[in-house]
Interface confidence: low
C-alpha cells in the first residue's frame, strides 16, 4: 500500500484538524522546552506544505518520508543548541538515526513549571476569544509534559476539554460546572499517560514479543468468545499502532488506530458482544470506548486446559513445531478463563509453563516431567492474591493518606537512595491503589491492583533510568518486565545504606504551609516523612507515627496562631529537637 506522497496520504486520511493536532503533539513531545508560538508556526508550515502535496503528489519534496520532513522542520529551530544542548547534535545525523536520536532525548521529567489553573472567568474568556488557540495550547501543554502520551487519545481528551468549556462557560455557575470536569480530565489524563508509558517501555526495553504477550493476555480476557486467530490479528494490529506511537510516528499511529476501530466494529460478531455501544460513536470516542470496553462473558462449558497442555502426549511436538504460537495459544486459553487474574500474573504463568517445557521436552520422559506443571502455578497465583488481601486490609484500616505513608516508609527503607520527590510521587500513587481497587468485588481486585501497580512502578523505573542511583532499582526494572512488582515487593531494608545526615533545614517550615491545599500539605508532610526515614532507616513504625503526629499538631497549632510566622519560628526548633530525641 505505497503512496507517492506519504504526507499527502496522511493528510487526506486524517483530515486537516486531526493532522494539525497530531503534528503539534509530535513536535511538542520532541521539543518540550520550545514556546507555544514557535510550535504553532512550525505546524502551520508543515500543514501548508502538506496541502501542496495533496494538490500535486509529484511536487518537490512531497515524496520524502515523514521523519525526514518533520526532522528537517525541527532542525530549523534557531535556539536548538542553547535550549537543548546535545540534542542539537541529532540534526547532524541522517534518518533513521536522527529520529532515534530525538526519541532518546525525550524527557519524562521535564523541568517545566506545574500548570496553574486560572480563574474560571479568565479561562472562559480565553476560550471564547480564540477557541482554536485555546485548544492547541491544551495539546501543547499536555504533550510537552507527557512526551509519550498516546497521541490519538490526547485528541479525544482535547475534544472533551472543548466540550466542557462549551457547556460550562454558558452555565449559571460556571465554576461548579467546569472544575469537576477539569479535575476528572486531569486525573484521567495522568492515568492514561502512565499506562501508555508502560506500553512504550515494554516495546522499547523488552521488545515487541513482550508487548504482544501482554496484548494476547489482555485481549483474551476482554474477548473470551473470540477465536485465537481473531485475537492474534487484533494483537498484531494493536502492536503496530503502539509501536508507531511510541516511535513518534503519530500520523501513522492515529490512522492505523482508526482502521483497527473500523475493523473491530465490522467484525463485532467474532470479537465481543460488548462492542455495540462503542461502535455507534464518532471516531475518537469510538476508539477510546473500544480500548476501555468491559470483559465479555466467558463462554459456557470451556473444556479443561489440562487436556491440551498437560495430558496430551503431543505437548512437546506441538511446542517444538511452533513455540510462540503454542505458548500464545496457552496464554490465550488461560487468560480467557481467568478474568480474575492480573495480566502480569498470566504472563508469569506462561513464562513458568515455557520454562517447564524447555526443561521437560529435553528429558527422558517428558510427559512424566511436565505432568505436575499446573501444580507449580499455585504459589505464583497465591502471592498476588495474598498481597492484595493484606494491602486492602491495611488500606481499610488506615485510610488513603496513612496508607500512603505506610508505603512511603516501606519503599524508602527498600530503596533509600532514590530522590525524595520520586519516592513521594511513586508512593502516593501506589497508595491510590486502595481507593481504586479495594472496593471492587474479589474477582476484580487482583487485575485492578497488580496491573495498576505495574504502571506506577514503571514510572519509578523511567525516572530512575534518567538518574540511576540504586542497583536494586536497576535490577528490578531491567531483569524482567513481568516480575517487576514481585521484585520490588521482595526487597527488604537496605542494610548497606549509610543514613543521611540530619539537616535541620529540611524540617524547617513557614507560615506559607497554612495557605496550601490539603493535597499540598500532605505532600509537605510526606516529604518530611521520607527524609526522616532516610535519616533513621531503622526507626520503628511507632517512632515514626509519634513524630508525624507531633508534626501534624505543630502545624495545626501554628496555623491557628495570630502570628503564624512567629509560631513556626519558635515551635519549629522545638519540634526538630523533640523528633531527634524520639528517634535517637
Amino acid at each position: 500500500d505505497t503512496h507517492k506522497s506519504e504526507v499527502a496520504h496522511r493528510f487526506k486520511d486524517l483530515g486537516e484538524e486531526h493532522f494539525k493536532g497530531l503534528v503539534l503533539v509530535a513536535f511538542s513531545q520532541y521539543l518540550q522546552q520550545c514556546p507555544f508560538e514557535e510550535h504553532v508556526k512550525l505546524v502551520n508550515e508543515v500543514t501548508e506544505f502538506a496541502k501542496t502535496c495533496v494538490a500535486d503528489e509529484s511536487a518537490e519534496n512531497c515524496d520524502k518520508s515523514l521523519h525526514t520532513l518533520f526532522g528537517d522542520k525541527l532542525c530549523t529551530v534557531a535556539t536548538l543548541r542553547e535550549t537543548y544542548g546535545e540534542m542539537a547534535d541529532c540534526c547532524a545525523k541522517q534518518e533513521p538515526e536522527r529520529n532515534e536520536c530525538f526519541l532518546q532525548h525525550k524527557d519524562d521529567n521535564p523541568n517545566l513549571p506545574p500548570l496553574v489553573r486560572p480563574e474560571v472567568d479568565v479561562m472562559c474568556t480565553a476560550f471564547h476569544d480564540n477557541e482554536a488557540t485555546f485548544l492547541k495550547k491544551y495539546l501543547y501543554e499536555v504533550a510537552r509534559r507527557h512526551p509519550y502520551f498516546y497521541a490519538p487519545e490526547l485528541l479525544f481528551f482535547a475534544a472533551r476539554y472543548k466540550a466542557a468549556f462549551a457547556e460550562c462557560c454558558q452555565a449559571a455557575d460556571k465554576a461548579a460546572c467546569l472544575l469537576p470536569k477539569l479535575d476528572e480530565l486531569r486525573d484521567e489524563g495522568k492515568a492514561s499517560s502512565a499506562k501508555q508509558r508502560l506500553k512504550c517501555a515494554s516495546l522499547q526495553k523488552f521488545g515487541d514479543r513482550a508487548f504482544k504477550a501482554w496484548a494476547v493476555a489482555r485481549l483474551s480476557q476482554k474477548f473470551p468468545k473470540a477465536e485465537f486467530a481473531e485475537v492474534s490479528k487484533l494483537v498484531t494490529d494493536l502492536t503496530k499502532v503502539h509501536t508507531e506511537c511510541c516511535h513518534g510516528d503519530l500520523l501513522e499511529c492515529a490512522d492505523d488506530r482508526a482502521d483497527l476501530a473500523k475493523y473491530m466494529c465490522e467484525n463485532q460478531d467474532s470479537i465481543s458482544s460488548k462492542l455495540k455501544e462503542c461502535c455507534d460513536k464518532p471516531l475518537l470516542e469510538k476508539s477510546h470506548c473500544l480500548a476501555e470496553v468491559e470483559n465479555d462473558e466467558m463462554p459456557a462449558d470451556l473444556p479443561s486446559l489440562a487436556a491440551d497442555y498437560v495430558e496430551s502426549k503431543d505437548v512437546c511436538k506441538n511446542y517444538a513445531e511452533a513455540k510462540d504460537v503454542f505458548l500464545g495459544m496457552f496464554l490465550y486459553e488461560y487468560a480467557r478463563r481467568h478474568p480474575d487474574y492480573s495480566v502480569m500474573l498470566l504472563l508469569r504463568l506462561a513464562k513458568a509453563y515455557e520454562a517447564t517445557l524447555e526443561k521437560c521436552c529435553a528429558a527422558a520422559d517428558p510427559h512424566e516431567c511436565y505432568a505436575k506443571v499446573f501444580d507449580e502455578f499455585q504459589p505464583l497465583v497465591e502471592e498476588p492474591q495474598n498481597l492484595v488481601k493484606q494491602n486492602c486490609e491495611l488500606f481499610e484500616q488506615l485510610g488513603e493518606y496513612k496508607f500512603q505513608n505506610a508505603l512511603l516508609v516501606r519503599y524508602t527503607k527498600k530503596v533509600p537512595q532514590v530522590s525524595t520527590p520520586t519516592l513521594v510521587e511513586v508512593s502516593r500513587n501506589l497508595g491510590k491503589v486502595g481507593a481504586k481497587c479495594c472496593k471492587l468485588p474479589e474477582a476484580k481486585r487482583m487485575p485492578c491492583a497488580e496491573d495498576y501497580l505495574s504502571v506506577v512502578l514503571n514510572r519509578l523505573c523511567v525516572l530512575h533510568e534518567k538518574t540511576p542511583v540504586s542497583e536494586k532499582v536497576t535490577k528490578c526494572c531491567t531483569e524482567s518486565l513481568v516480575n517487576r512488582r514481585p521484585c520490588f515487593s521482595a526487597l527488604e531494608l537496605d542494610e548497606a545504606y549509610v543514613p543521611k545526615a540530619f539537616n535541620a533545614e529540611t524540617f524547617t517550615f513557614h507560615a506559607d504551609m497554612c495557605t496550601l491545599s490539603e493535597k499540598e500539605k500532605q505532600v509537605k508532610k510526606q516529604t518530611a516523612l521520607v527524609e526522616l526515614v532516610k535519616h533513621k532507616p531503622k526507626a520503628t513504625k511507632e517512632q515514626l507515627k509519634g513524630v508525624m503526629d507531633n508534626f501534624a499538631a505543630f502545624v495545626e497549632k501554628c496555623c491557628k496562631a495570630d502570628d503564624k510566622e512567629a509560631c513556626f519560628a519558635e515551635e519549629g526548633p522545638k519540634f526538630v529537637a523533640a523528633s531527634q530525641a524520639a528517634l535517637a
Epitope: E311, K317, V325
Partner: nanobody
Framework: EVQLVESGGGLVQPGGSLRLSCAAS????????MSWVRQAPGKGPEWVSA????????RYAESVKGRFTISRDNAKKTLYLQMNSLKPEDTAVYYC????????GSQGTQVTVSS
C-alpha cells in the same frame, strides 16, 4: 488472512449421516488444535468437539458422544466432522474454530435433521 470455509451440510432424515469439512488457510493449520461448534436457531453457540494439532487427542460434548467423529488431514489443511445417527436436535449451523473457541469466525454450514 485467516480463513475457515465449512461445507458438507444439508437436509437429512433422522438416523442419517453427513460429513462436514472445514478448509483452512492463512495460518499454520498443523500447529493448532481445532474445534467444531454449532448454533441452533435462537440459541447460543455450543461446543461440539475438539481435536489436538496432531489428531491424536479428540474430545466430544456429551450430547454427541458415540455418534460424531472429529478428524483432520494436516497435509490438506482440512478438518472433518463425521456425523452419524443424526437427531432433530442436531439441527444447527455448524462451524469450525481454532482452539476451543465458541466464537463464529466463519459463515458455517447449515445442517437440518427433519423427516
Amino acid at each position: 488472512e485467516v480463513q475457515l470455509v465449512e461445507s458438507g451440510g444439508g437436509l437429512v432424515q433422522p438416523g442419517g449421516s453427513l460429513r462436514l469439512s472445514c478448509a483452512a488457510s492463512g495460518f499454520t493449520f498443523g500447529s493448532f488444535g481445532m474445534s467444531w461448534v454449532r448454533q441452533a436457531p435462537g440459541k447460543g453457540p455450543e461446543w461440539v468437539s475438539a481435536i489436538d494439532s496432531g489428531g491424536a487427542d479428540t474430545r466430544y460434548a456429551e450430547s454427541v458422544k458415540g455418534r460424531f467423529t472429529i478428524s483432520r488431514d494436516n497435509a490438506k489443511k482440512t478438518l472433518y466432522l463425521q456425523m452419524n445417527s443424526l437427531k432433530p436436535e442436531d439441527t444447527a449451523v455448524y462451524y469450525c474454530t481454532i482452539g476451543q473457541s465458541t466464537s463464529r469466525g466463519s459463515q458455517g454450514t447449515q445442517v437440518t435433521v427433519s423427516s
